[in-house]
Interface confidence: low
């Protein structure tokens, strides 16, 4: 028979002849021949291989770097790689979290919308109308006014988006 | 049907040689890999030889390594076995197998899927 | 070269029971593509050795179901869910990872 020119799923080709590929996890040590297949080992502690492949030596599992503010979040398997996560109050720099950065502070009228995860940074959104921010956090929200009026009291300093307003008591009509 | 018929067992004198023949018919012997394999009178079976589709590859125990000669013509579908300086414990039936794979098709692997009936070598004074 | 070692030796079986063969080899008949690379024969009396099942698991063409292939790596097991007269006979496993091929002592199954 002739010669392949391409092979099956999870085989590879080499010296006109399809051999099957190391599964994930493990490398190739020696191609196949007439009378022997493809000859794999599993890969070393701190390594991976993640799909069906003919490499012969292993990737090395990532390296969550604590001096980056980096911890590990999922071990690395032989099949797969190391996930690095950022420490308690840190977000990654990218997708790939190589680094971390401390979580923005929302500033004096500004509240938190979306509070930050190890993979993606604060949201702060401007204290609308009725509602007041008066500290530089990465946690809290606009808070809204107080009510004056539920208190039996009056308004004697409007608030703004960075101060909560002042209540003081009605003046009482002189009899 | 698939067949496998093996002759040129007989009855030699240690030292001397012979020469087995297998004769294949009912599918395409040029795209199969064939085995010789032997069974000793009251034993077990032994794995003697591999010879690949296209003769180009060729693979010995070490009891018959320097001895034994495998080697096949596709134009006759015959697969042969060339057995010089016999010893006594070479006495044994012989069987040729076919190994069940297409061609170069490494992936697919389907066991030794067709047998011959056997020959028997005895080797004696 | 891989040394397959099988028990027992000698099975006697009751007709409709189920029996079991076990074979060992000396290293992992399972390579990178995950298939193990052993197979089961069986030899009636006074005939050729059949072929049952290849790659650890795969009933050959023409094989009753009743015969099955299971293990991983070096600890494989055929097994005959309800024996009948004339599955009696020399059982060998093979691999077939390596040349050398190596063969297992063979299992004689006979009736009681």
């Known amino acids: 028979p002739e010669p392949p020119t391409a092979c099956r799923e999870k085989q590879y080709l080499i010296n006109s002849q399809c051999c099957s590929l190391c599964q994930p996890g493990q490398k190739l040590v020696s191609d196949c021949t007439e009378f022997t297949e493809t000859e794999c080992l599993p890969c070393g502690e701190s390594e991976f291989l993640d799909t069906w492949n003919r490499e012969t030596h292993c990737h090395q599992h990532k390296y969550c770097d604590p001096n980056l503010g980096l911890r590990v979040q999922q071990k690395g398997t032989s099949e797969t790689d190391t996930i690095c996560t950022c420490e308690e109050g840190w977000h990654c720099t990218s997708e790939a979290c190589e680094s971390c950065v401390l979580h923005r502070s929302c500033s004096p009228g500004f509240g938190v919308k979306q509070i930050a995860t190890g993979v993606s940074d604060t949201i702060c959104e401007p204290c609308p109308v009725g509602f007041f921010s008066n500290v530089s956090s990465a946690f809290e929200k606009c808070h809204p006014w107080t009510s004056c009026e539920t208190k039996d009291l009056v308004v004697q300093q409007a608030g703004t988006n960075k101060t909560d307003v002042v209540c003081g008591p009605q003046d009482r009509l002189r009899a | 049907q698939v067949q496998l018929v093996e002759s040129g067992g007989g009855v030699v004198q240690p030292g001397r040689s012979l020469r087995l023949s297998c004769v294949a018919s009912g599918f395409t012997f040029s795209n199969y890999g064939m085995h010789w394999v032997r069974q000793a009178p009251g034993k077990g079976l032994e794995w003697v030889a591999i010879i690949s589709y296209d003769g180009s590859n060729k693979y010995y125990a070490d009891s018959v390594k320097g001895r034994f000669t495998i080697s096949r013509d596709n134009s006759k579908n015959t697969l042969y076995v060339q057995m010089n300086s016999l010893r006594a414990e070479d006495t044994a039936v012989y069987y040729c197998?076919?190994?069940?794979?297409?061609?170069?098709?490494?992936?697919?692997?389907?066991?030794?899927?067709?047998w011959g009936q056997g020959t028997t070598v005895t080797v004696s004074s | 070269d891989i040394v397959m070692t099988q028990s027992p030796l000698s099975l006697p079986v009751t007709p409709g029971e189920p029996a079991s063969i076990s074979c060992r080899s000396s290293q992992s008949l399972l390579p990178g593509n995950g298939y193990n690379y052993l197979d089961w024969y069986l030899q009636k009396p006074g005939q050729s050795p059949q072929l049952l099942i290849y790659?650890?698991?795969n009933r050959a063409s023409g094989v009753p179901d009743r015969f099955s292939g299971s293990g991983s790596g070096t600890d494989f097991t055929l097994k005959i869910s309800r024996v009948e007269a004339e599955d009696v006979g020399v059982y060998y496993c093979m691999q077939a990872l390596q040349t050398p091929r190596t063969f297992g002592q063979g299992t004689k199954v006979e009736i009681k």
């Open positions: 197998a076919r190994r069940g794979h297409y061609g170069r098709d490494y992936y697919s692997y389907y066991g030794l899927d067709v």
């Open positions: 790659l650890g698991s």
